[in-house]
């Protein structure tokens, strides 16, 4: 399954929207920095592109879940958030089309359950951090920057796999 070119454009638009969502400077939130332990090796490295698809799908689904909470709606600009949801939704559709075709399911041992669990735990650590920090503006800014970093890493790894094939 070849993801459409629009998928790459969508990834770039998602990153642009995340950048535009910034409300305060990360430098004013240095004391709130946190290592969430992003499992970046699970998005590329020794995998074939097909094997990363369920993992990338999980990543985008978790981003969608994280930013579609009541607390998130209160933290970010509503117009940008709506555009962000639309981009994520389209990317989920692209990836689901690939999964339905059987790539990443029939050829993937254990459906990469270990990688998917690692991604879920990563997002739960983020959720717990926000809760502990009482969803403060600095906590949300740390999370926004973290999601930009991890999303960029995961999509870059996907792109490098695509170019190798």
């Amino acid at each position: 399954c070849d993801l459409p070119q629009t998928h790459s454009l969508g990834s770039r638009r998602t990153l642009m929207l995340l950048a535009q969502m910034r409300r305060i400077s990360l430098f004013s939130c240095l004391k709130d920095r946190h290592d969430f332990g992003f499992p970046q090796e699970e998005f590329g490295n020794q995998f074939q592109k097909a094997e990363t698809i369920p993992v990338l799908h999980e990543m985008i689904q978790q981003i969608f879940n994280l930013f579609s909470t009541k607390d998130s709606s209160a933290a970010w600009d509503e117009t940008l958030l709506d555009k962000f949801y639309t981009e994520l939704y389209q990317q989920l559709n692209d990836l689901e089309a690939c999964v339905i075709q059987g790539v990443g399911v029939t050829e993937t041992p254990l459906m990469k359950e270990d990688s998917i669990l690692a991604v879920r735990k990563y997002f739960q650590r983020i959720t717990l951090y926000l809760k502990e920090k009482k969803y403060s503006p600095c906590a949300w800014e740390v999370v926004r920057a973290e999601i930009m970093r991890s999303f960029s890493l995961s999509t870059n790894l996907q792109e490098s796999l695509r170019s190798k094939e």
């Epitope: 590329g44 020794q46 995998f47 359950e113 270990d114 990688s115 669990l117 735990k121 739960q124 650590r125």
Partner: antibody, heavy 119, light 111 residues
């Protein structure tokens, strides 16, 4: 029949680095999460860490800095960076087929390899 | 660091009887169900009995039953057999994998 076996255990002096190796039979290591667990003589089990199918490594708190887990296409290695007498134990390599239920659900275990750290 | 406390540390059971082993975590395991139970006999590696708190591993007799959620878990062995004499361990998986750990173990003696 799918199995794992550890090797490399021996008597070492404190501070001498030692690498244990886990070899798989009947399956590809690249497709599974593989962990290391140890057991001191007459004591309980201790979770050291795990390497996921993609290569991400997690260590338990006390093991960080003391051990390094790495994976190649044919082996999973556990390097003891600077062993002390407290690291004397049988070291087990294990695989989980149930990673959705956590990284402690190991269902295929090797027989273990004994490491003795003594001066 | 998380602590998994197993009680009792040793228990005696008659053949045909029932044994219950408790495993208490100082914090909820991941997803409230990421807890496994193992059986270990002297000189052998551990054997997985239960994963996901209550799912029986392949080839394990239905006499073994896992229950519980969150922080409190129980392994129950009914119709105890001589072959069940062993040490049993619980193992917890947490949202932060640096906290993954085994319980201290429970020795089951069969009379």
């Amino acid at each position: 029949c799918q199995s794992v076996e550890e090797s490399g255990g021996r008597l070492v002096t404190p501070g001498t680095p030692l690498t244990l190796t886990c070899i798989a039979s009947g399956f590809s290591l690249s497709s599974y999460a593989m962990g290391w667990v140890r057991q001191a003589p007459g004591k309980g089990l201790e979770w050291i860490g795990i390497v996921l199918s993609g290569g991400t490594v997690y260590y338990t708190n006390w093991a960080k800095g003391r051990f390094t887990i790495s994976k190649t296409s044919s082996t999973v290695d556990l390097k003891m960076t600077s062993p002390t007498t407290e690291d004397t134990a049988t070291y087990f390599c294990a695989r989980t087929d149930y990673p959705a239920y956590g990284f402690t659900s190991f269902n295929i275990w090797g027989p273990g390899t004994l490491v003795t750290v003594s001066s | 660091a998380q602590v998994l406390t197993q009680t009792p540390s040793s228990v005696s059971a008659a053949v045909g009887g029932t044994v219950s082993i408790s495993c208490q975590s100082s914090k909820s395991v991941y997803n409230n169900n990421c807890l496994s139970w193992f059986q270990q006999k002297p000189g052998q590696p551990p054997k997985l009995l239960i994963y996901g708190a209550s799912t029986l591993a392949s080839g394990v007799p239905s006499r073994f039953k896992g229950s519980g959620s969150g922080t409190q878990f129980t392994l129950t062995i009914s119709d105890v057999q001589c072959d069940d004499a062993a040490t049993y361990y619980c193992a917890g998986d947490y949202v932060d994998d640096m906290e993954n750990t085994f319980g201290g173990g429970t020795e089951v003696v069969v009379k």
